[in-house]
Structure formats: C-alpha cells, structure tokens
C-alpha cells in the first residue's frame, strides 16, 4: 500500500526534512506550508493550524515561495536616465535599465543603480570599443592614414581617400582633399566620397582642434570600471 500523504502541519520523521514548498517552524516544531510568490505569511502555523498566507500589498512583492511576515518593498521609481524594463508586481521587483545612449556605471543585484551617458570620441579619435549596457566607450587615436572628423560615441577612424593629386593632405581629424573631381579609390568600404568641399561628408566636420596643454603621451581612459592604458591625447 502507498504511504499515507501527510498534510501540513505535520511532525517530520526524525532526521528527515520537510518537503518542497514547506518549511520547518521552530516554534511549532512542525513542517508547514510556505506561501506562494506574491504572498506572505500573515499568521504562522501552530501544531494544529497551517500557515495563513495573504497577498502582497501594492508596491511590495515576493518572488519565491516563502514564509516572510512582510513582502519586500519594490525599488524606487526609475530615474529620468533609466527605463523600466520590468514593472513592480506582487511577484517581482521593478527593474530599471539605462536608456539608449547611456550605460550602467554602478550596478546592483538586479538592474542598475546609476546610469551615465556614453562618452563620445573627439575629432582625431575613433571608437576602439563601443559602449555596452555596462561599459563606456573606449576611444583610440586615429592611426596614420585614417581620420575621424566627428564627435561621436559610434564613429570609428576611417581611411583617408586616395587622391590622384592631393590638394590638402589628410590628418587624424580631416580627410584628404583631392584636386581632381573624384578620388581614384577609397579604402573605406561602402563609403560615398563626394567631391570638394569635404564638409559635405559630415554635418559635424570641424577644423583640427588646436593643441591643448595636455601632454603628448597617449592615454586611454577606461571602459567601465577597468584601469586605463596609456596612449596619445591627440591634442
């Protein structure tokens, strides 16, 4: 014959544990029912009565089977630099993630504690590593033969156009200018190279920034919380 199923509350056999979705109440010394997600223990069990569960109040939750006397408070409303990717319900906490163009600079167990805008790379620098949900952009100086004339968190260094005759040589922050109506070829895949003036290439074309007082040694600041490597300020 099958063993008789015990109904909560019941005294466990010596050395045995309570079943799934049950807990051992030290005071009653009985195995008692846990409350389901979205509920909490309103009245703890006794030797003769099981746990009495009640629904979580607004703005509180329990995610797991439990016997907590009070539901957990949902996190505060998402800040202006965040979006709510999971609403506060009786069964789950609110989760806030950073809005597009921002990254999580200080994380917490679930979601993000503090968002920061993705930094942009200045003219003469391109994106070495794009920003992610949890890390900032990393910039790198444009190598000889390449340039970036934008302030952008996405633009990489692009090759200078190749000219039959060069009117103005390119540098790290400006494309080469050709004297002929069109360049012989461009190393930039899929890029459309317009004839002069070069400013038609980008709405953000800028003259080469004047030198700053920054040192000539190069310096890459970190992506997210990782230490920087040294390299050129490009100033």
């Amino acid at each position: 014959l099958p063993a008789q199923v015990a109904f909560t509350p019941y005294a466990p056999e010596p050395g045995s544990t309570c079943r799934l979705r049950e807990y051992y109440d030290q005071t009653a010394q009985m195995c008692c029912s846990k409350c389901s997600p979205g509920q909490h223990a309103k009245v703890f069990c006794t030797k003769t009565s099981d746990t009495v569960c009640d629904s979580c109040e607004d703005s509180t939750y329990t995610q797991l089977w439990n016997w907590v006397p009070e539901c957990l408070s949902c996190g505060s409303r998402c800040s202006s630099d965040q979006v709510e990717t999971q609403a506060c319900t009786r069964e789950q906490n609110r989760i806030c993630t950073c809005r597009p163009g921002w990254y999580c600079a200080l994380s917490k167990q679930e979601g993000c504690r503090l968002c920061a805008p993705l930094r942009k790379c200045r003219p003469g620098f391109g994106v070495a590593r794009p920003g992610t949900e949890t890390s900032d952009v990393v910039c790198k100086p444009c190598a000889p033969g390449t340039f970036s004339n934008t302030t952008s968190s996405t633009d990489i260094c692009r090759p200078h156009q190749i000219c039959n005759v060069v009117a103005i040589p390119g540098n790290a922050s400006m494309d080469a200018v050709c004297t002929s109506t069109s360049p012989t070829r461009s190393m930039a895949p899929g890029a459309v190279h317009l004839p002069q003036p070069v400013s038609t290439r980008s709405q953000h074309t800028q003259p080469t920034p004047e030198p700053s007082t920054a040192p000539s040694t190069s310096f890459l600041l970190p992506m997210g919380p990782s230490p920087p490597a040294e390299g050129s300020t490009g100033d």
């Epitope: 942009k120 003469g124 910039c139 920034p209 700053s212 310096f219």
Partner: antibody, heavy 121, light 110 residues
C-alpha cells in the same frame, strides 16, 4: 589659450545672476567647459559642464537652479537663480582636458582666476 | 552617489622629505582620478590625471598611484613651494553626484 570669468558681484538673496566665461584660443566646438565653485575657506565644489556637442550635466544640488549654456563661439554662461547666502563663493570656469580622446572626462586642465559672488542681505 | 574622502588636514613635511596624501572613493572609479594643487588666491592646478599620469610641466617629484577605490599622491623631495592644499577628483561619474572633489588636504612645509 586662456579662460576668464566675469559677472561676479554682491547680490541679495533670491536675485538671479549670470556669470560669463570667455575663452581665448579654445574652440568650444572641440572642448568641454565646466564650472566649479569654492566658498571662502572651503573646498572645491563641482557644479557641472557643457560638452563640445552641447550636452549639459550637473551636480545633483545644482539641477534646476543652475543652467550652463554656450552663448557664442567664445563664451559659456552660468545662470543662477534663487541664490542664497550658501551660494557665496568664487566661481571658476575650466576647460576639460579631453584625455584619452574623450569629449569630456570631468577633469579640468585649464582654469580661470575665478569671479567672486557674494549673496548677502 | 560616489563620495571622495581625503587624508585629514594638515599634513606636515620637512623640506626634502616625503608627503603621502590618500584619497578614497566609496565606489570603484577605475583610474578616473585626478589630483590638483591649489595655493591661496589662485585657481587649482592639475597635477595628475588617470590616477598616475603626470600633467605636462608638472615636476617629477609628484607621483600618483592606485586604482579602484584607493589612491595616493606622493611628493618626494618636498620643497617650500609645495605648501598648498591638494584635492583629488573623480571623473568616472559626473551626473547624479553631489560633488566630484575630495575635501582637500593642506600640506604644511617646515
């Protein structure tokens, strides 16, 4: 290259005031400019900055009361409202170093001499 | 919010000696840290950025170290001219913060 602040004066509480930062030899479309203040005998206090692309960021306490804007190719303004005696300080304008090729790093390598704002009744 | 805490003032040093100033961040800021020197009546002067990179024109007796939450500014072979207040500043977070600067540490040279 230089940075100079102007507009600091004695004002009564509640009076709005605008400070101007005038730069020379600095392209404001390439560099980020910030404001920092220092109360008499106290430490440095970050206010905020305006990036080369025109985005503004502020310290929590400055949000809503302080506004940074570019007013020309050589000037950046700091507009202050609802001033109290706690706002008495020397206000510095400074250029972001742009280290690592970043548009802004929050680290300033060229500072003006500052302009004194006194709020008193 | 990230808060920067510095060595209490004042710190005394003899000419030719060594001074160490510590700066602690409440959260990891990687190497986004700068050190400034300020003398009375003058604006701050950037000494070090990236925790350890010396700004152009700054004497090599100044050095910086650390990453994460613990940082140090060291002045070796202290000179009379080094008497000033020194500030650390984090550049990791510049929005949703109350201040990016530490409280400052005054160095007195005897």
């Amino acid at each position: 290259q230089s940075v100079e602040e102007s507009g600091g004066r004695l004002v009564t509480p509640g009076t709005p005031l605008t400070l101007t930062c005038t730069v020379s030899g600095i392209d404001l479309s390439s560099y980020t400019m910030g404001w920092v203040r220092q109360a008499p005998g106290k430490g440095l206090e970050y206010i905020g900055f305006i990036s080369s692309s025109g985005h503004t960021y502020y310290a929590n306490w400055a949000k809503g009361r302080f506004t940074i804007s570019k007013t020309s190719s050589t000037t950046v303004d700091l507009k202050m409202t609802s001033l109290t005696t706690e706002d008495t300080a020397t206000y510095f304008c400074a250029r972001d170093g742009g280290y690592g090729g970043y548009d802004y790093t929050g680290i300033f390598n060229l500072w003006g001499q500052g302009t004194l704002v006194t709020v008193s009744s | 919010d990230i808060v920067m805490t510095q060595t209490a003032s004042p710190v005394s040093a003899a000419v030719g000696g060594t001074v160490t100033i510590k700066c602690q961040a409440t959260e990891s800021i990687s190497s986004w840290l700068a050190w400034y020197q300020q003398k009375p009546g003058q604006p701050p002067k950037l000494l070090i950025y990236g925790a350890s990179t010396l700004e152009s024109g700054v004497p090599s007796r100044f050095s910086g170290s650390g990453s994460g939450t613990e940082f140090t500014l060291t002045i070796s072979g202290v000179q009379c001219d080094d008497a000033a207040t020194y500030y650390c500043q984090q550049g990791y977070i510049y929005t949703n913060v109350d201040n990016t600067f530490g409280g400052g540490t005054e160095v007195v040279v005897k």
